[in-house]
Interface confidence: low
């Protein structure tokens, strides 16, 4: 019996289309596939950022694959050909690995790149990113922000910079159509007459950095002699009610502080007829059903009842 062998894929390469971290891995079929014309060849692809402990593994019949990477680090990938057992009358046959790497040659020392990059997607509507200039860079240094997500033809530059002392220190983004639940890629690079500036790359998903508006229309209703219902409304905007968690702070007669986290726009408080003053505030956050992470809103305006019979009065802010 002659041993069945198969070659690795040809022309394996990582292609950077200029999408700030979203790369194409592509290859060509192996040489000498004539013996296996009736056979569907598969490829096992492994790839990772250099320094990562684990490889991502994909088995595909295609000649390309796309994924996002951290361009602050290099990328390594390897691929081999798989002949399924149906093609070989026995066990699966694997070729040797073809390997490739990709990295962006870094310019400038790390200290020149932007510091403390912070991005917030306000009310799931308005994205704002801010940063501090690199350590020791001169005032002639300016930074430029570029961004891309699937749906854009090419990376776009910020058109509305936030400035301080003539330097760009932030970006207000335009309306970003169909941009959540997918990776959002940012590059902040810089220029200076005196020294090269290191670029920084960031990737996140917008739904995970949402800071909602605070709840509105806080009200009290006496439910019974010992229960008061606190109610509020979700703020205007695109975030559906099912996506909110709330945190409440309640102060009774300036002594007791109650804090609670709830999923609905109501909270029932046990109280006594002796309660003279009751105040509460609420803040909101996108919950785990709609995102993996989020930022608490600011606290709502405080709503207080003081010195009147709650059973006779419902307060509406």
């Amino acid at each position: 019996d002659t041993e069945i062998k198969v070659n690795p894929p040809q022309d394996f390469e990582i292609v950077d289309p200029g999408y700030l971290g979203y790369l194409y891995l592509q290859w060509q079929p192996p040489l000498s596939l004539d013996h296996f014309k009736e056979c569907t060849v598969e490829y096992e692809l492994k790839y990772r950022n250099i320094g990562s402990e684990t490889w991502k593994t994909i088995i595909t019949k295609n000649l390309h694959y796309k994924d996002g990477f951290d361009l602050n680090k290099g990328i390594e990938a390897k691929i081999h050909t798989l002949l399924p057992w149906q093609c070989t009358n026995g066990s699966e046959v694997q070729s040797s690995w073809a390997e490739t790497t990709y990295w962006i040659s870094p310019q400038g020392i790390p200290e020149t790149k932007v510091q403390d990059m912070d991005c917030v997607y306000y009310n799931w509507q308005y994205l704002l990113c801010s940063w501090k200039p690199g350590i020791g860079v001169l005032l002639d240094t300016n930074y430029n922000l570029f961004y891309w997500y699937e749906g854009l033809d090419h990376a776009l530059q910020c058109v509305d910079y936030i400035k301080a002392d003539g330097q760009n220190i932030g970006c207000r983004f335009p309306y970003l159509e169909a941009s959540d639940y997918k990776d959002f890629y940012i590059c902040v690079n810089g220029s200076s007459e005196n020294k090269p500036i290191r670029s920084s790359y960031f990737t996140f998903q917008l739904q995970n950095i949402v800071k909602p508006l605070p709840p509105v229309y806080l009200t009290f209703t006496r439910e019974s002699s010992c229960e008061i219902k606190l109610k509020w409304s979700i703020p205007l905007g695109p975030i559906p009610a099912r996506c909110f968690d709330y945190e409440i702070e309640i102060r009774e007669d300036d002594t007791t502080l109650v804090t609670a986290t709830v999923e609905n726009e109501t909270y029932t408080l046990k109280t006594t007829n002796e309660t003279r003053q009751l105040c509460f505030v609420v803040r909101s956050k996108v919950n785990i059903y709609c995102s993996d992470d989020g930022i608490w809103s600011e606290w709502s305006d405080k709503q207080c009842w003081e010195g009147e019979d709650l059973s006779k009065k419902t307060l509406l802010r």
Epitope: N62, H64, K66, E150, G151, D153, P240
Partner: antibody, heavy 119, light 111 residues
């Protein structure tokens, strides 16, 4: 602006095949899937399948899997659907419709191609 | 396959009316905290038009009088104040699982 322009109406005999085209413009063709949807006269909508314009990966409705073949020509930003072994119940308008991902819906549609199967 | 059942199959309404169309899936169409539910409008002789995606998100350029709600298996399309151009057929569609499936449609007619 996004445009999907489909080929003209076809009259074909039972048992024959037909190949419909859908030419895309106004967006990055390879970033999206292209779906095909059938609408028989006076009837509802029926999803046939979709193709990834970048990699050529296909997903089919099992009902059409043996008779529908989706292909893509990236050089002309055109997607094709070939329907074989035609029968009278295949008489319908066939639409192509662009979609980014499962959660985003089919946001742009072609004008439709009427296929009439008649002897 | 996931079956989609719309109700009513047709309704008569007047301009200015609030109209509600419901759609029930045979199993949950939720995943990753998203409802994979879309709503389309179709006028005679025209291609469908996306109104709502992900259960409650408006398609680009659609009037704010169209809104979607629901999760799991039960979903609603609401037209807050019916306009003359809204008389059409409306379809729900799930995109959680291949094959994607549509409701049978709801025809909104002039009373």
């Amino acid at each position: 602006q996004v445009q999907l322009v489909q080929s003209g109406a076809e009259v074909v005999k039972p048992g024959a095949s037909v190949k419909l085209s859908c030419k895309a413009s106004g967006y990055t063709f390879t970033n999206y899937w292209m779906n095909w949807v059938k609408q028989a006269p006076g009837q509802g909508l029926e999803w046939i399948g979709r193709i990834d314009a970048y990699a050529g990966e296909t997903h089919y409705n099992q009902k059409f899997k043996d008779r529908a073949t989706l292909t893509v020509d990236k050089s002309t930003s055109t997607v094709y659907m070939e329907l074989s072994s035609l029968r009278s119940e295949d008489t319908a308008v066939y639409y192509c419709a662009r979609g980014y991902g499962d959660a985003y819906g089919m946001d742009h549609w072609g004008q439709g191609t009427l296929v009439t199967v008649s002897s | 396959d996931i079956q989609m059942t719309q109700s009513p199959s047709s309704l008569s309404a007047s301009v200015g009316d609030r109209v509600t169309i419901t759609c029930r899936a045979s199993e949950s169409v939720d995943n990753y905290g998203i409802s994979f539910m879309n709503w389309f409008q179709q006028k005679p002789g025209k291609a469908p038009k996306l109104l709502i995606y992900a259960a409650s998100r408006q398609g680009s350029g659609d009037p704010s009088r169209f809104s979607g709600s629901g999760s799991g298996t039960d979903f609603t399309l609401t037209i807050s104040s019916l306009q003359p151009e809204d008389f059409a057929t409306y379809f729900c569609q799930q995109s959680k699982e291949v094959p994607w499936t549509f409701g049978q449609g709801t025809k909104v007619e002039i009373k």
